[in-house]
């Protein structure tokens, strides 16, 4: 097993929006949880966009999933990522 | 089974503070929020705020900022809800909760019963 | 702060009958991702509250198919389709799109 590096990265969006994007990458086997959270509830599938899990060339794969925020609001949001039987929640970065 | 135990009835006088405790058991603790919930009596329900017991993060209703403090104890996967400057307002029972997947109070302690009296 | 106003404050009904309990937000509390953090509870006396729905219309789990949730935007309603006696007690909606999360003044549903 080969647990993921999780990174968060914010862009901006529409006004008084941005974007926040949270990647894994480098984990094995390719089997997953990210996804992102607000106030520690996951939010609906329909208000996430996801990326498909691929392999990265190094026997290891990589993954991300996104959603808009309103500016401001960064705290409220998490990105969860639950890999063979572990777990973190990573912040959007101010 | 989920589960969140909260402690005893306090009594404390008007200025004093008080502790609230809430016991986690049957998941792993720091994979959910804990929140705290007032409700006075005969009222409605009040939003204290949250702690993501992972990061320590805390986000708080502005109402109760600088009278409640909100932290945890990973080791004994307890969740503590500080209240200082106590007055007869802080009467009432407060309740710990837990989120799910996709709701936010799904797993509720008994509640803990607080009076301010001198 | 958004306003939470349910109506009416108190229901009487009679058992079977279908009970609607509406709930107005003060602003839209649909997130800017499309997300609506809207749900309902029931509250029974010396208890602590029950979470009956989530995210507008979605049961939760071992909650009957007589409860039913509906709305967008500010207005939202709860339906019993028939009620039991299991039912009776104080039903709150609470939204937590935005901080601070805010729940309804509560409607009391009672025997007539």
């Known amino acids: 097993t080969v647990p993921p590096m999780v990174n968060v990265t914010r862009s901006e969006a529409s006004e008084g929006n941005i974007t926040v994007t949270c990647r894994a990458s480098g984990f094995y086997p390719w089997n997953i949880t990210l996804s992102w959270r607000q106030d520690g509830v996951s939010l609906s599938h329909d208000t996430q966009q996801w990326g498909d899990v691929l392999p990265d060339g190094n026997g290891t794969y990589q993954t991300w999933v996104a959603t808009r925020i309103c500016q401001g609001e960064e705290q409220r949001f998490t990105c969860y990522m639950e890999h063979s039987g572990n777990h973190s929640t990573h912040p959007v970065p101010s | 089974e989920i589960q969140l135990q909260q402690s005893g009835p306090e009594l404390v006088k008007p200025g004093a503070s008080v502790k609230v405790s809430c016991t986690a058991s049957?998941?792993?603790?720091?994979?959910?929020?804990i929140y705290w919930v007032k409700q006075s009596h005969g009222k409605s329900l009040e939003w204290i705020g949250y702690i993501d017991p992972y990061t320590g993060g805390t986000i708080s209703n502005q109402k109760f900022t600088g009278r409640a403090t909100l932290t945890v104890d990973k080791s004994s996967s307890t969740a503590y809800l500080h209240l200082n400057s106590l007055t007869s307002e802080d009467s009432a029972v407060y309740y710990c909760?837990?989120?799910?997947?996709?709701?936010?109070?799904?797993?509720w302690g008994a509640g803990t019963t607080v009076t301010v009296s001198s | 702060d958004i306003l939470m106003t349910q109506t009416p404050l108190s229901l009487p009904v009679s058992l079977g009958d279908q009970a609607s309990i509406s709930c107005r937000s003060s602003q839209s509390i649909v997130y800017t991702n499309g997300n609506t953090n809207l749900e309902w509870y029931l509250q029974k006396p010396g208890q602590s509250p029950k979470l009956l729905i989530y995210?507008?219309?979605n049961r939760f789990s071992g909650v009957p198919d007589r409860f039913s949730g509906s709305g967008s935007g500010t207005d939202f309603t709860l339906k019993i389709s028939r009620v039991e006696a299991e039912d009776l007690g104080v039903y709150y909606c609470f939204q937590a799109s935005y901080v601070p999360f805010t729940f309804g003044s509560g409607t009391k549903v009672e025997i007539k």
């Open positions: 049957g998941y792993a603790f720091t994979k959910y929020n």
């Open positions: 995210k507008v219309s």
């Open positions: 909760a837990r989120p799910g997947s996709y709701w936010y109070f799904g797993v």
